[in-house]
Interface confidence: low
């Protein structure tokens, strides 16, 4: 069937339109175009005879039409009057005629719109504003934008006049925004420039800052006032009802008790004519006395005495506060406060209770601190320590031992050998020792104030032969890439060389291996699984040597990224799927499987008999090592094909 298609259907003035003919019959004599829905000689635009390829203009020809051999008609420089129907009359060679009608619409290119307003400075909660989109244009649609968003749903927003007018009832400060209007027709869309709505509002109730209402005599008073307002508010200050100044800030230096009273800030908006006030009551306090601490025991004995600290002076209706080490009092059954908090009692003092202690008197405004007080707690002596820690010495060297015990006042020291008193000094020195100097060396520490004494005994061996050493470790199960391990060769011996072997080889050069403490300590930083070897230490001097038993390092590692085998990812329907997962790990990891994210079983092997295309998906193996706290996983895609096809295995 003969049809006419208009391209485009909606045409802008000045543009062109093509009336495209479809299903043109064969064996044509010619054709003719008419304006309107029927063949009317008075409204003929153009005729065309195929044999002569001759086009003949008709009465309705405007000079803007071009007819093509395929009967299509192009109309250029479209005007408004071109809107409507167009009829094609086709004359076939057998003189049987056919007709078809098409149509298009013409619309003007819209001008850029603008916004007019009936009120440029509306007052909040009082005025309405009507925006109108200019100019008024026929067959145009009007749209509105607020801050480049479409209009919000609000009972205060009303569209009228075919959406050309936007009315905001009872404007608020939140209506201060960018407004745009847009005109649209089927061939164009234009948006106006922004119009900013300037809503007059306020002043709101002013706020006075800072909020602080209590001051100390001698301080400066600096109050600031602010009220939300458009245009900005004008401010006035009143003290006890008396006008002070017309500023936003009020400053009074070096205030006294006489400056106590009510302070009023008044905010005024000259455009809205509104006033709002806020009142704050300021209280100025006199300076209180500085407190100090008294103690009932200036030299208490550790674990025996109690100490009562009292905050002076005593003032009625006053709050007393305490601090220890610049912190508020810790919760402790050994700390007790009196009912008025003025006395702090320390029950059974310890050496850690030295302080410093401070007390404070709190008035309405601030807290005044005392000077700090430190307790002289008598303690000790603790068990003395004898240094150096060597227990083996070679004959002929000098023996020099030193003793120390924590004590207040400092301890007095005595030395005994095999129970016999030697001397009353902190250090014991014996030159050119022999095997006869072997024995029990005792240090006794005495506190003259508490009368307490403590002793420590050390066995000293003088011998040319070295003992069999042993290895101690600070970490028996280090985690790979995380922990360090320190091996120490025991015992500590004087004038002795320490040696180390790993798997029977001398130490390799490595930035992760470090010798210290006279080569007596071997530290492995950031251990790896390759460090799980046998370590041996040796000691030697000029007359003997000895080796320790080996110590094997048990490094926890993994799990590494698992490997799923076999590597095949394509299977035929009906086959058995047997996937095995393996991950290097110490200790052995726990395994679990997920298919398409759904947990399956906690085994190393996943077996599914007689798989089908329903078993397509992602197969994930998860491994976790409870000792290292680490996890790992790998995902494999499995494709199952119907039995008739033979897919190639993918890598």
């Amino acid at each position: 069937k003969l049809t006419i298609e208009s391209t485009p259907f909606n045409v802008a003035e000045g543009k062109e339109v093509l009336l495209l003919v479809h299903n043109l019959p064969q064996h044509l004599f010619g054709y003719s175009w008419y304006k309107g829905e029927r063949v009317d000689g008075n409204r003929q635009i153009i005729g065309y005879v195929i044999g002569t390829q001759q086009a003949t203009p008709g009465p309705a020809y405007s000079g803007r039409e071009i007819i093509y051999p395929n009967a299509s008609l192009l109309i250029q420089n479209i005007i408004q009057n071109d809107t409507g129907f167009y009829t094609l009359h086709v004359i076939k060679s057998d003189l049987v005629n056919e007709e078809a009608t098409g149509q298009f619409r013409v619309y003007p290119e819209l001008p850029k719109p603008s916004i007019s307003s009936n009120n440029s400075k509306p007052v909040e909660d009082k005025d309405a504003v009507a925006f109108t989109c200019e100019p008024e244009t026929q067959d145009a649609t009007y749209l509105w934008w607020v801050n480049n968003q479409s209009l919000p749903v609000s009972p205060r927003l009303q569209l009228s006049n075919g959406n050309r007018t936007l009315t905001l009832f009872n404007v608020t400060r939140n209506d201060t925004a960018s407004y745009k209007c847009e005109t649209q027709n089927p061939v164009s869309a234009r948006r106006s420039d922004s119009v900013i709505l300037n809503v007059l509002y306020g002043p709101d109730a002013p706020t006075i800052s800072p909020l602080n209402t209590s001051y100390r005599s001698g301080e400066n008073l600096n109050l600031s006032c602010h009220a939300a307002s458009n245009p900005p508010a004008q401010y006035s200050w009143f003290v006890n009802g008396t006008f002070q100044q017309s500023t936003q800030e009020l400053f009074i230096p070096n205030i006294t008790v006489n400056n106590s009273g009510s302070y009023t800030c008044q905010a005024h908006n000259s455009d809205t004519g509104l006033n709002r006030t806020t009142v704050t009551t300021i209280t100025v306090y006199a300076e209180p006395p500085k407190p100090f601490i008294t103690s009932n025991n200036s030299n208490p004995v550790e674990d025996e005495d109690a100490v009562a600290l009292t905050c002076e002076p005593e003032i009625q209706n006053t709050t007393y506060l305490w601090w220890v080490n610049n912190q508020s009092l810790p919760v402790s059954p050994r700390l007790q406060l009196s009912n008025d908090n003025r006395t702090l009692t320390l029950l059974s003092v310890t050496r850690n209770d030295v302080g410093p202690y401070e007390c404070g008197i709190q008035n309405e405004l601030s807290v005044d601190h005392s000077d700090p007080v430190i307790l002289n707690v008598l303690y000790g002596p603790d068990d003395p320590t004898i240094s150096p820690s060597y227990t083996y010495y070679r004959p002929g060297v000098n023996l020099s031992l030193s003793c120390h015990a924590a004590s207040n006042p400092p301890a007095q020291y005595s030395w005994l050998i095999d129970g016999n008193i030697q001397q009353h000094t902190q250090e014991l020195f014996i030159s050119n020792i022999t095997e006869k100097n072997s024995g029990l060396y005792t240090c006794q520490a005495n506190n003259s104030a508490s009368g307490h004494s403590r002793t420590t005994v050390k066995t000293i061996t003088v011998s040319a032969e070295l003992p069999k050493p042993s290895i101690s470790s600070n970490n028996s199960k280090p985690v790979e890439d995380k922990d360090a391990v320190a091996f120490t060769c025991e015992p500590e011996a004087q004038n002795t060389t320490y040696l180390w072997w790993v798997n029977g080889q001398s130490l390799p050069v490595s930035p992760r291996l470090q010798l210290s403490n006279g080569n007596r300590t071997l530290t492995l930083f950031n251990v790896t699984r390759n460090d799980a070897r046998a370590y041996v230490c040796g000691i030697q001097n000029s007359v003997s040597a000895n080796r320790s038993d080996p110590v094997t390092l048990d490094v926890l590692y993994g799990p590494d990224t698992p490997i799923i085998s076999p590597p095949d990812s394509s299977y035929l329907s009906g086959a058995n799927l047997n996937l095995s997962c393996h991950s290097a790990s110490n200790p052995s990891p726990q395994y679990s499987w997920r298919i398409n994210g759904i947990p399956q079983q906690h085994t190393q092997v996943l077996f599914i008999a007689k798989i089908t295309p329903n078993n397509n998906g992602t197969y994930a193996c998860f491994v976790s090592n409870l000792a290292t706290g680490r996890n790992n996983s790998i995902v494999k895609s499995i494709t199952v094909s119907a039995s008739g096809t033979s897919p190639g295995l993918s890598a």
């Epitope: 990224t561 490997i563 398409n596 397509n616």
Partner: antibody, heavy 117, light 111 residues
Framework: EVQLVQSGAEVKKPGASVKVSCKAS????????MNWVRQAPGQRLEWMGD????????SYNQNFKGRVTITRDTSASTAYMELSSLRSEDTAVYYC??????????WGQGTLVTVSS | EIVMTQSPATLSVSPGERATLSCRAS??????????IHWYQQKPGQAPRLLIY???NLETGIPARFSGSGSGTEFTLTISSLQSEDFAVYYC?????????FGGGTKVEIK
Amino acid sequence: EVQLVQSGAEVKKPGASVKVSCKASGYTFTDYHMNWVRQAPGQRLEWMGDINPDIGGTSYNQNFKGRVTITRDTSASTAYMELSSLRSEDTAVYYCARWDFDSFANWGQGTLVTVSS
Amino acid sequence: EIVMTQSPATLSVSPGERATLSCRASESVSIIGTNLIHWYQQKPGQAPRLLIYHASNLETGIPARFSGSGSGTEFTLTISSLQSEDFAVYYCLQSRKIPYTFGGGTKVEIK
């Protein structure tokens, strides 16, 4: 922050080979597959292949008929792509891309390879 | 291999307008409920940047005006309100089967 830094631009003659490197940082190199994608002028992006840095396993686009080889050096956290038997149509920007969430999550800055006689 | 077809080749849009880009796969790229299709943005002289993964998941740091939808073989990338920095070429990628393949791209240009 994940970063992939590629080697500089190369000019090669037809028949020669080119090897582009991609150094990774900001994540564990062996945990994620590394892919290579190229983009010839005016053409769509074309996936060339990938490597699992942990075990060295590779997959390739058969359109390259065995001309592409992808390798890695885990100690240097670096992946390499070598393309042999170069022809003029191999002129392209070559990208490395880290594989995550079933897609190319992070890309290198690209390396321009020009093949010209 | 799976052939990815994007349309239109060029899309002219004004800033603030909505843009809708299409991507069609020659066969299904879904597997067990997951759509293995991803969208990338590329600007001149830069590497592609991942916007959407698994058809509809927004990559970290990508603005919410980008969204993806679709399943099976038909997928759509939508930019709700185009910003100046969004004018670029957009590619879809399928990772359902090796070789992974990209669409020919849609260039989004300023109208």
